[in-house]
Interface confidence: medium
């Protein structure tokens, strides 16, 4: 989907971000249409995530003069991960295997996958409100990092988990940055 917006972009100030595990999420995923891939390992002692570890970030947005009425909730995609066990990276084979190559796991990173364009309202000191569109991350995915390329390279091999349903007016591809532009 190509967004036809011609809105002016504004810089912003973001207040400190406390991160919370997705299990503590206060977002109603049924309400927001989200079916996020759970970050469940193969066994409880696993040190590397199977799929992505999805952290919840809560922050207030400001345009310098006005601040968001309610905190913005989004995902932060971070850390190492492993592709789904159907991929040929597993040692020992079989559905019940609990062991995998530590070396290969280090080539996989959890990055932004799905985003949505969301409207926010900012409250101003004079009592007025302002409205903007911002892009927030709604799902993460495990991507394979090709080591011979620079860290800033976009040479990724993608393994997407279950596609999250979105119920949003505009949908955009995620950038690797989680910074917001007000528009």
């Amino acid at each position: 989907f190509k967004n036809d917006a011609t809105e002016i972009l504004y810089s912003h100030v973001v207040k400190p971000v406390p991160a919370h595990p997705s299990s503590n999420s206060t977002l109603n995923q049924a309400r927001n249409g989200g079916r996020h891939f759970s970050s469940t390992g193969l066994d409880r002692n696993s040190r590397v995530q199977v799929g992505c570890r999805e952290l919840r970030s809560t922050k207030y947005i400001s345009d310098g003069q006005c601040t968001s009425i309610s905190p913005l909730k989004e995902l932060v995609c971070a850390g190492e991960c492993l592709p789904l066990p159907v991929l040929p990276n597993w040692i020992g084979g079989g559905y019940g295997t609990k062991y995998w190559s530590r070396r290969s796991s280090q080539e996989w990173r959890c990055v932004n996958d799905k985003t949505r364009t969301q409207r926010i309202q900012l409250q101003c000191q004079d009592g007025s409100t302002r409205t903007y569109k911002i892009t927030v991350v709604t799902a993460c995915k495990c991507k394979r990092y090709t080591r011979q390329h620079n860290e800033s390279s976009h040479n990724f091999e993608s393994v997407s988990p279950a596609k999250p349903a979105q119920h949003h007016r505009e949908r955009k591809r995620a950038s690797k940055s989680s910074k917001h532009s007000l528009s």
């Epitope: 989907f1 967004n3 809105e7 969301q118 309202q121 007025s128 903007y132 119920h167």
Partner: antibody, heavy 123, light 107 residues
């Protein structure tokens, strides 16, 4: 009380332009996107586009991009839609409508509508 | 663009009856559907958003359900003042699109 008061009916000639106004009251004008919708017997309801009163930024339905221009005047809490190069197919009722969304930023729908402005294109 | 199809252009019902209006999306729109009521000579009025959320002040007899591509709007006990055209609208992607409308007629 939230109100959207639209300008009166227009009778215009083919090829001409018309500018419809929508004056908002009862809420913070810059706090909500303003949408415009066309209603004709042939095509039911069609979304034309929306404007952010805070920034003046617009998003158009591709179908209406060459037809409609959306603007706002924050000082008077008024949204405008100009329609150009009018033909008989543009004869319709046009509505402005405030976009409702929850505090979580989703759940979009148009919760307050103007009374509509009838535009008739005839020679 | 996503096409919203309301298969029934007209529906006839009696006061006190339960009536359901259906709407089908041409692709998955999750729960991003709103329902509007338009009475003769009036502007549309928002009843339901996000498929099942009743807008402020809307009577409890109006309900919405569905997700994906199939949606239903129900009036549990039709009143005489419910005579109107009902429209579904998807707000999943731009441009938002409306169904053709279902006119509810009271017998």
């Amino acid at each position: 009380e939230v109100q959207l008061q639209q300008s009166g009916p227009e009778l215009v000639k083919p090829g001409a332009s018309v500018k419809i106004s929508c004056k908002a009251s009862g809420y913070s004008f810059t706090g909500y996107y303003m949408n415009w919708v066309k209603q004709s017997p042939e095509k039911s309801l069609e979304w034309i586009g929306e404007i952010n009163p805070t920034t003046g930024g617009t998003t158009y339905n591709q179908k209406f991009k060459a037809k409609a221009t959306l603007t706002v005047d924050k000082s008077s809490s008024t949204a405008y839609m100009q329609l150009k190069s009018l033909t008989s197919e543009d004869s319709a009722v046009y509505y402005c409508a405030r976009l409702h969304y929850d505090y979580d930023g989703v759940g979009y729908a148009m919760d307050y509508w103007g009374q509509g402005t009838s535009v008739t294109v005839s020679s | 663009d996503i096409v919203m199809t309301q298969s029934h252009k007209f529906m006839s019902t009696s006061v006190g009856d339960r009536v359901s209006i259906t709407c089908k999306a041409s692709q998955d729109v999750s729960t991003a559907v709103a329902w509007y009521q338009q009475k003769p000579g009036q502007s549309p009025k928002l009843l339901i958003y996000s498929a099942s959320y009743r807008y402020t002040g809307v009577p409890a007899r109006f309900t919405g359900s569905g997700s994906g591509t199939d949606f239903t709007f129900t009036i549990s006990s039709v009143q005489a003042e419910d005579l109107a055209v009902y429209y579904c609208q998807q707000h999943y992607s731009t441009p938002p699109t409306f169904g053709g409308g279902t006119k509810l007629e009271i017998k």
